[in-house]
C-alpha cells in the first residue's frame, strides 16, 4: 500500500487525497490537515508547517474534522421552546435536545428549534405511533375493532373492550369505539326497556 502523503503538500488540481481530514489552502496552493473533532486551528498551515490544533475550551465544541479558528459555544436546551436535554455538550458534540413529553417539533433548522403541544385525539381515536417521538404532530386514527378510547387526549391509547364472560358476567351493552362494553351480573333483572320481553 502507498504511504500517506504528509501535509502540507502541493496540489495543482485543488483537491486533497483525504477530503475528510485535509483541506485545500488556496493562498499557498497546498493541502493541509484539518483539526480533529474537539479541537480548532490555533495556527494556520503554511508551505513549511502543517496546521496546529488545540483542544476546545470548556463549554465549547467542534463536531467534525475542521479548519475553524474557534470552537462553537455550547448552548443549553431552551425549555421556553419546549426542549429538554438528553445528552450534555462535550468538546466533540453539541448538547443533544428533544421535545418535552406531550410536545412535537414544530420548527426544524438542521435540528429542532421549537416544540408545540401535541393535538388531542378525540374519543374513538388514538395517535398513530411514530418511529421517533416528538418528530411530528399527532395523526389520529380510529380505534380498531374491539377497542375503545373515551377521552380527548394527545397520548391515550385505544384499549380492548372488556370481555364480560372472563369476569363471570354477561354483556349488558356492547362496546363502541368510544365506550367499553357494559357488563352485568347474570342474575340481575333486565333493564327496564327490556322488561316484558320474555324469551321462552
Amino acid at each position: 500500500s502507498q504511504p500517506q502523503a504528509v501535509p502540507p503538500y502541493a496540489s495543482e488540481n485543488q483537491t486533497c487525497r483525504d477530503q475528510e481530514k485535509e483541506y485545500y489552502e488556496p493562498q499557498h496552493r497546498i493541502c493541509c490537515s484539518r483539526c480533529p473533532p474537539g479541537t480548532y486551528v490555533s495556527a494556520k498551515c503554511s508551505r513549511i508547517r502543517d496546521t496546529v490544533c488545540a483542544t476546545c475550551a470548556e463549554n465549547s465544541y467542534n463536531e467534525h474534522w475542521n479548519y475553524l479558528t474557534i470552537c462553537q459555544l455550547c448552548r443549553p436546551c431552551d425549555p421556553v421552546m419546549g426542549l429538554e436535554e438528553i445528552a450534555p455538550c462535550t468538546s466533540k458534540r453539541k448538547t443533544q435536545c428533544r421535545c418535552q413529553p406531550g410536545m412535537f417539533c414544530a420548527a426544524w433548522a438542521l435540528e429542532c428549534t421549537h416544540c408545540e403541544l401535541l393535538s388531542d385525539c378525540p374519543p374513538g381515536t388514538e395517535a398513530e405511533l411514530k418511529d421517533e417521538v416528538g418528530k411530528g404532530n399527532n395523526h389520529c386514527v380510529p380505534c380498531k375493532a374491539g377497542h375503545f378510547q373515551n377521552t380527548s387526549s394527545p397520548s391515550a391509547r385505544c384499549q380492548p373492550h372488556t370481555r364480560c364472560e372472563n369476569q363471570g358476567l354477561v354483556e349488558a351493552a356492547p362496546g363502541t369505539a368510544q365506550s367499553d362494553t357494559t357488563c352485568k351480573n347474570p342474575l340481575e333483572p333486565l333493564p327496564p326497556e327490556m322488561s316484558g320481553t320474555m324469551l321462552m
Epitope: 504511504p3 504528509v6 501535509p7 503538500y9 508551505r47 513549511i48 508547517r49
Partner: antibody, heavy 119, light 107 residues
Framework: QVQLQESGPGLVKPSETLSLTCTVS??????YYWSWIRLPPGKGLEWI?????????NYNPSLKSRVSMSVDTSKNQFSLKLSYVTAADTAVYYC?????????????WGQGTLVIVSS | DIQMTQSPSSLSASLGDRVTITCQAS??????LIWYQLKPGKAPKVLIY???NLETGVPSRFSGSGSGTDFTFTISSLQPEDIATYYC?????????FGQGTRLDIK
C-alpha cells in the same frame, strides 16, 4: 529524531563520476522529498536537485545534464551521481529531507561530506 | 531562476551586539523564505521559516521579517555560539536558490 549520513569517496578524478549515498535513520524514507545541496569552497550553497520517495526527480537546470538521483526504500537510502566532474565540482555535499510531502524546505540535513575533484 | 542577493558577505561584531543581515529576491517570493545556520562539520540548521517564524527550539534572540522581495534576519544579542555562516533560501519556485551567505565572526 531523523538523522542523515552522507557517504562516498572523498576524492574523484576529473571526468569521472562522483557517487554519494545518503543513509536515513530514525524515520522512513517514504512520503518525503530528499535533496542534495553542495557548498563549494569560498562560494554559497547550491541546490543540486531532489528525488521523491516514489522516484520522481527535479534537478537544477545548471547541472541537469550531468545529474542522476535514485532511491532505495528497502535500504532507507538515496543516492547522487554527478558525471564528468571538474575541479569546479569540489565541494561539501549535503543530503537533506523536506518538512513534509512537498519540496519547499529542508528540515533535516546531514553533516556533509567533502568531495575533492583532483587528478 | 530567482536570484537571492544577501548582504553583507561577512561581518564582525562584538558579543551582545545586534546583528542584521538582509536578503533581496529578484522577484516577489511572498514569505517563502528560510534562514539557515551553517557551522563547519555540523548539520545545517533551520532558524527561521516562512520569513518570520522561529523554528522550534531556536533561541528567541533570532528573528526574521519581510515579505515580497526584501527580508531581514536579526540576532538581537550576539552570543559566542552564533559564530557561523547564515544563508537565506527561497522556496517560491524551483529551482531552489540560496543567498551567497554571510560569514559572522567576533570582533
Amino acid at each position: 529524531q531523523v538523522q542523515l549520513q552522507e557517504s562516498g569517496p572523498g576524492l574523484v578524478k576529473p571526468s569521472e563520476t562522483l557517487s554519494l549515498t545518503c543513509t536515513v535513520s530514525g524515520g522512513s524514507i517514504s512520503s518525503y522529498y530528499w535533496s542534495w545541496i553542495r557548498l563549494p569552497p569560498g562560494k554559497g550553497l547550491e541546490w543540486i536537485g531532489y528525488i521523491y520517495y516514489g522516484g520522481s526527480t527535479n534537478y537544477n537546470p545548471s547541472l541537469k545534464s550531468r545529474v542522476s538521483m535514485s532511491v532505495d526504500t528497502s535500504k532507507n537510502q538515496f543516492s547522487l551521481k554527478l558525471s564528468y566532474v571538474t575541479a569546479a565540482d569540489t565541494a561539501v555535499y549535503y543530503c537533506a529531507r523536506s518538512y513534509s510531502s512537498a519540496w519547499y524546505g529542508s528540515a533535516y540535513w546531514g553533516q556533509g561530506t567533502l568531495v575533492i575533484v583532483s587528478s | 531562476d530567482i536570484q537571492m542577493t544577501q548582504s553583507p558577505s561577512s561581518l564582525s561584531a562584538s558579543l551582545g551586539d545586534r546583528v542584521t543581515i538582509t536578503c533581496q529576491a529578484s522577484q516577489d517570493i511572498s514569505n517563502y523564505l528560510i534562514w539557515y545556520q551553517l557551522k563547519p562539520g555540523k548539520a545545517p540548521k533551520v532558524l527561521i521559516y516562512d520569513a518570520s517564524n522561529l523554528e522550534t527550539g531556536v533561541p528567541s534572540r533570532f528573528s526574521g521579517s519581510g515579505s515580497g522581495t526584501d527580508f531581514t534576519f536579526t540576532i538581537s544579542s550576539l552570543q559566542p555560539e552564533d559564530i557561523a555562516t547564515y544563508y537565506c533560501q527561497q522556496y517560491d519556485h524551483l529551482p531552489i536558490t540560496f543567498g551567497q551567505g554571510t560569514r559572522l565572526d567576533i570582533k
